[in-house]
C-alpha cells in the first residue's frame, strides 16, 4: 500500500515569495506523484513546478494559488491511487490603488460647506490599516472637520472648506508590507481670497542667446501678489535683478521674459502667488539650454541586390530630443515605399543596383543640426574580363595566369592549386587585378589552377592547366671539385633533364680522349682503378634537339685517403702534471690535424701557455686541472676527406701515501708520470 511519509499542510504565504508544499510517499513499487488544485491537475510552469514529489512555488500568486492543493500518488502496477490531506495557502498581500471621490458623485458637485468623502483603494490580506495625507502631511483621526473610517477605507470632510483644498494621498500597512496610493486626488474648494492658478509656467528649452518666456498667472479677490525667484531664492523684479539676470523682465500680467539666454541662466524658476488668505502657491518651471552632440560615424555598407536591409541612425544626445530624418541625393526619404524611413531606420527593400550611393542621416533641434553620411554599395556578382587560359610556362622564369573580373565592390580574387588555397609567399603573388604571378616556375608547378572572384553578391570561378616547359639542366649539377681514392674504383655521375631526354657524354677538358680503363656509361664516368694520371679537368655535356647543349666542368683530384698512424689513447694524469695525447695521420694531400676538446675546436693561435699542438699533430697539456677532463677528438683532414678519432682524458688527485704502504708501492691505476 502507498503510505504518505510527509503530507502537505496549510500554511501562511507571502505574495510573490517562495513556498513549498511537501509530499513524500513510500510504496512497494515505483509510484508517480502528481498534484491537484481544486481537483484539477497542476501543470508545471516556471513559477510553480514539481520538485521531486513536492510542489515548489518560485513566487506565490494570490489569484492562481488560491484553492485546495492535494498530492496524489499513483502505483501503476497495482493501480492504487492515494490522496494526501488537503492543503491551502493563507496568502498575505497588499496592492496599491488610487484615491477616488466617493461622495459627491462628481468633482463638479463639490461646493464649500458640503460633505466630501474620499476612498483609499489599497487592498490586502490581512486587512491593512490606513493613513491619510494632505499635501504630504499626515492627517490624524479626530482632527477638526474630518473623520477616518478604517473599515471602509474612507476619509470624510464635513463640512469641506477652502482650507481642505490640497493633494490627498493614502498609505496602508499590514503584516505583509506597505503600499501607497498609485494615484492621488486633488481637492480644490474655492475661497475667493485664496490664490488660484490661472496659468502655470511650463519648462522651456531654448537655444543659446535666444529668449525664453515663462507665463504665470494667479487669481484671487482681492488680487494676489506674484513673485518670481531663481534657483538660489533670489527675487527677480524689474527694479532689483540679480547680476546674472540683467536681461530679465517681469510683465504686469506675471510673465517673465529672459533675453540673450546664457548657460548661467539655466535652472529652476519659481513663481509664487499669495492671496489675502491661504497658503502661498509655488509653481516651478525649468529653463534648459538646448544642446546637440556630434553623431557617430557610419561604416560603409555593402548590400546585395534583392535583399532587404536596414541602417539605424543613432540620434546624437541632445535637448530637446533631436528629430531624425534620412536624405538621399538631397531629397528627404518618405515614410513608406521601397526605400523609406521607419523610425530612425533607413529601410531598403528589394534592393536594386540603382540604390547605391550616399545616404545622409540628419538630426536637428533648437541647438543646431548634425549630419552623417553612410556610403551604400550594392554588390553585384563578378563578370569576366579575362579568364585564366591553359598556359605553357618556362621553367625558371616568372609565369602569369590572368583572372580579370569586374563587379561592385571590387571583387576579391583567390587562387587554388590542386584544390589547395594558394597563400602568398616568396613564389606566389596575386596582383590587385587578380593576376597570379609564379615568380620562378618549377617543374612541379605543372598542374590545375583555379581562380575564384567574389563579392557579397556571389562568386564566379574558372580553371586552367599549366604545362611547364622544362629547361635543359643538370639534375643535380655535378660537384665542380671531386676526389677519387688512388688505386680504387670510382664513379662520377652526371644526369640532366629537358623537354626532350638529353644525350649525356663526358670528355677531358683538353679534348683528349678517355683512356680505355675509363668508360662513359649513360653519363656515369667509371674508373676501374684510379691512377695519378686520371686527375684533371673533365666536362659533362648534355644536349637535345630543341634546346641545344649545356656543359658542366669537374676537376677530379686523385688522393690517398687519410689513415691514422698514431691514435690518442685513454689517458689518466695527476692534477698539476702534464698530459700528452698523441695523433699522427697520413694521406695525400698531406692531412692537417685539428683538436677538439670538450665539444669546441682548439684554435692553435688561442691555446694559451698550458696547451700546445706539435708539428706531428700531438697535443700536450701542462699543469692539468680537473676541468681539463673530458673527451678529446683528433680531426685529420685534407681537400679530399676528413677523419677523426677520440680518447678520454681523466685528471685525478695525487693520493697521500698511507703508513702501511712502502715507498715503492705502485699507483692504483695506469698513469703518465712526468
Amino acid at each position: 500500500a502507498i503510505v504518505f511519509i510527509k503530507q502537505p499542510s496549510s500554511q501562511d504565504a507571502l505574495q510573490g515569495r517562495r513556498a513549498l508544499l511537501r509530499c513524500e510517499v513510500e510504496a512497494p513499487g515505483p509510484v508517480h506523484v502528481y498534484w491537484l488544485l481544486d481537483g484539477a491537475p497542476v501543470q508545471d510552469t516556471e513559477r510553480r513546478f514539481a520538485q521531486g514529489s513536492s510542489l515548489s512555488f518560485a513566487a506565490v500568486d494570490r489569484l492562481q494559488d488560491s484553492g485546495t492543493f492535494q498530492c496524489v500518488a499513483r502505483d501503476d502496477v497495482t493501480g492504487e491511487e492515494a490522496r494526501s490531506a488537503n492543503a491551502s495557502f493563507n496568502i498575505k498581500w497588499i496592492e496599491a490603488g488610487p484615491v477616488v471621490l466617493k461622495h459627491p458623485a462628481s468633482e463638479a458637485e463639490i461646493q464649500p460647506q458640503t460633505q466630501v468623502t474620499l476612498r483609499c483603494h489599497i487592498d490586502g490580506h490581512p486587512r491593512p490599516t490606513y493613513q491619510w495625507f494632505r499635501d504630504g502631511t499626515p492627517l490624524s483621526d479626530g482632527q477638526s472637520n474630518h473623520t477616518v473610517s478604517s473599515k471602509e477605507r474612507n476619509l470624510t470632510l464635513r463640512p469641506a472648506g477652502p482650507e481642505h483644498s490640497g493633494l490627498y494621498s493614502c498609505c496602508a500597512h499590514s503584516a505583509f508590507g506597505q503600499a501607497c496610493s498609485s494615484q492621488n486626488f486633488t481637492l480644490s474648494i474655492a475661497d475667493e481670497s485664496f490664490a488660484r492658478v490661472v496659468l502655470a509656467p511650463q519648462d522651456v528649452v531654448v537655444a543659446r542667446y535666444e529668449e525664453a518666456m515663462f507665463h504665470c498667472q494667479f487669481s484671487a479677490q482681492p488680487p494676489p501678489s506674484l513673485q518670481w525667484l531663481f534657483e538660489d531664492e533670489t527675487p527677480i523684479t524689474n527694479r532689483s535683478r540679480p547680476p546674472h539676470l540683467r536681461r530679465a523682465t517681469v510683465f504686469a500680467n506675471g510673465s517673465l521674459l529672459l533675453t540673450q539666454v546664457r548657460p548661467r541662466n539655466a535652472g529652476i524658476y519659481r513663481c509664487i502667488g499669495q492671496g489675502q488668505r491661504g497658503p502661498p502657491i509655488i509653481l516651478e518651471a525649468t529653463l534648459h539650454l538646448a544642446e546637440i552632440e556630434d553623431m557617430p560615424l557610419f561604416e560603409p555598407r555593402v548590400f546585395t541586390a534583392g535583399s532587404e536591409e536596414r541602417v539605424t541612425c543613432l540620434p546624437p544626445k541632445g535637448l530637446p530630443e533631436p528629430s531624425v530624418w534620412w536624405e538621399h541625393a538631397g531629397v528627404r526619404l518618405p515614410t513608406h515605399g521601397r526605400v523609406y524611413q521607419k523610425g530612425h531606420e533607413l529601410v531598403l527593400a528589394n534592393i536594386a543596383e540603382s540604390d547605391a550611393g550616399v545616404y545622409t542621416c540628419h538630426a536637428a533641434n533648437l541647438a543646431g543640426q548634425r549630419r552623417q553620411d553612410v556610403n551604400i554599395t550594392v554588390a553585384t556578382v563578378p563578370s569576366w574580363l579575362k579568364k585564366p587560359q591553359d598556359s605553357q610556362l618556362e621553367e625558371g622564369k616568372p609565369g602569369y595566369l590572368d583572372c580579370l573580373t569586374q563587379a561592385t565592390p571590387k571583387p576579391t580574387v583567390v587562387w587554388y592549386r590542386n584544390q589547395m588555397l594558394i597563400s602568398e609567399d616568396s613564389r606566389f603573388e596575386v596582383f590587385k587585378n587578380g593576376t597570379l604571378r609564379i615568380n620562378s616556375v618549377e617543374v612541379y608547378d605543372g598542374t590545375w589552377y583555379r581562380c575564384m572572384s567574389s563579392t557579397p553578391a556571389g562568386s564566379i570561378e574558372a580553371q586552367a592547366r599549366v604545362q611547364v616547359l622544362e629547361k635543359l639542366k643538370f639534375t643535380p649539377p655535378p660537384q665542380p671539385q671531386q676526389c677519387m681514392e688512388f688505386d680504387k674504383e670510382a664513379t662520377v655521375p652526371c644526369s640532366a633533364t629537358g623537354r626532350e631526354k638529353p644525350t649525356i657524354k663526358w670528355e677531358r677538358a683538353d679534348g683528349s680522349s678517355l683512356p680505355e680503363w675509363v668508360t662513359d656509361n649513360a653519363g656515369t664516368l667509371h674508373f676501374a682503378r684510379v691512377t695519378r694520371d686520371d686527375a684533371g679537368n673533365y666536362t659533362c655535356i648534355a644536349s637535345n634537339g630543341p634546346q641545344g647543349q649545356i656543359r658542366a666542368h669537374v676537376q677530379l683530384t686523385v688522393a690517398v685517403f687519410i689513415t691514422f698512424k698514431v691514435e690518442p689513447e685513454r689517458t689518466t694524469v695527476y692534477q698539476g702534471h702534464t698530459a700528452l695525447l698523441q695523433c699522427e695521420a697520413q694521406g695525400d694531400p698531406k692531412p692537417l690535424i685539428q683538436w677538439k676538446g670538450k665539444d669546441r675546436i682548439l684554435d692553435p693561435t688561442k691555446l694559451g701557455p698550458r696547451m700546445h699542438i706539435f708539428q706531428n699533430g700531438s697535443l700536450v697539456i701542462h699543469d692539468v686541472a680537473p676541468e681539463d677532463s673530458g673527451r678529446y677528438t683528433c680531426i685529420a683532414g685534407n681537400s679530399c676527406n676528413i677523419k677523426h678519432t677520440e680518447a678520454p682524458l681523466y685528471v685525478v688527485d695525487k693520493p697521500v701515501p698511507e703508513e702501511s704502504e712502502g715507498p715503492g708501492s705502485p699507483p692504483p691505476y695506469k698513469m703518465i708520470q712526468t
Partner: antibody, heavy 113, light 107 residues
Amino acid sequence: EVQLVESGGGLVKPGGSLRLSCAASGFTFSSYIMNWVRQAPGKGLEWVSSISSSSTFIYYADSVKGRFTISRDNAKNSLYLQMNSLRAEDTAVYYCAKGFDYWGQGTLVTVSS
Amino acid sequence: DIQLTQSPSFLSASVGDRVTITCRASQDISSYLVWYQQKPGKAPKLLIYAASTLQSGVPSRFSGSGSGTEFTLTISSLQPEDFATYYCQQLNTYPRTFGQGTKVEIK
C-alpha cells in the same frame, strides 16, 4: 480476493457500437486506476485506455481515440468502455485490469459484416 | 511513443534449461517495466514489476534485471509449467506499450 468480470462482448457490424462492462470486487474500487487491454486473435497485447480513481485523468491509445470512451461508477464498483464506429481491426478479447496486477478473463468482441 | 522490442520472438528449450529474454526500450524508462506470462486462452499473469521485483506468489526461479533501456527476464531452471508466451510492458509514460512477446516452446 480480487475479482474482475467483463461482459458486453459479442458480434457487431463495422460502424456499430458496443458497451463493455467490468464488475469489480475484493478491493476498494474507488482508490484504484483501471485499464482496458485487448488482444487480437493470435496477436500480442495492446493497451486501450486508462482511468484514474476519481476520473481526473483519462488516457487512450491513438488507435481508439475519438471512438472509445472509458468511464467508471465508483458507487457501483463498475468500469465501462463505450465503443463506437467499430472497425474489423477492433476484433479482440478485451481485458479489464486493476492497475496491471489483476486481470479479468476477458470478453470477445467480433466486428464483422 | 516508446517502442519495446523483445528478443528472441521464439525460443525452444528443455526442462532445466536457463532461459533469458531481453526487452529493449526506444528511450529511457528508468525501472518502470513489468513482465507477464500468458498461457493460451488465459489472461496475462504479472511476474515482475519495477524491472526486478518478484510479484507475490511467483516462483523464485523467475528474476528480472536492468534499467534505462535494457532489461532481461531470466528463468534459472525451466519447468514444464513455464512453457508460455512472455510479454514486457513499460509504465513510464502514456501510451502504455507492450513488447511483441516471446514464445517459449518445448524443444
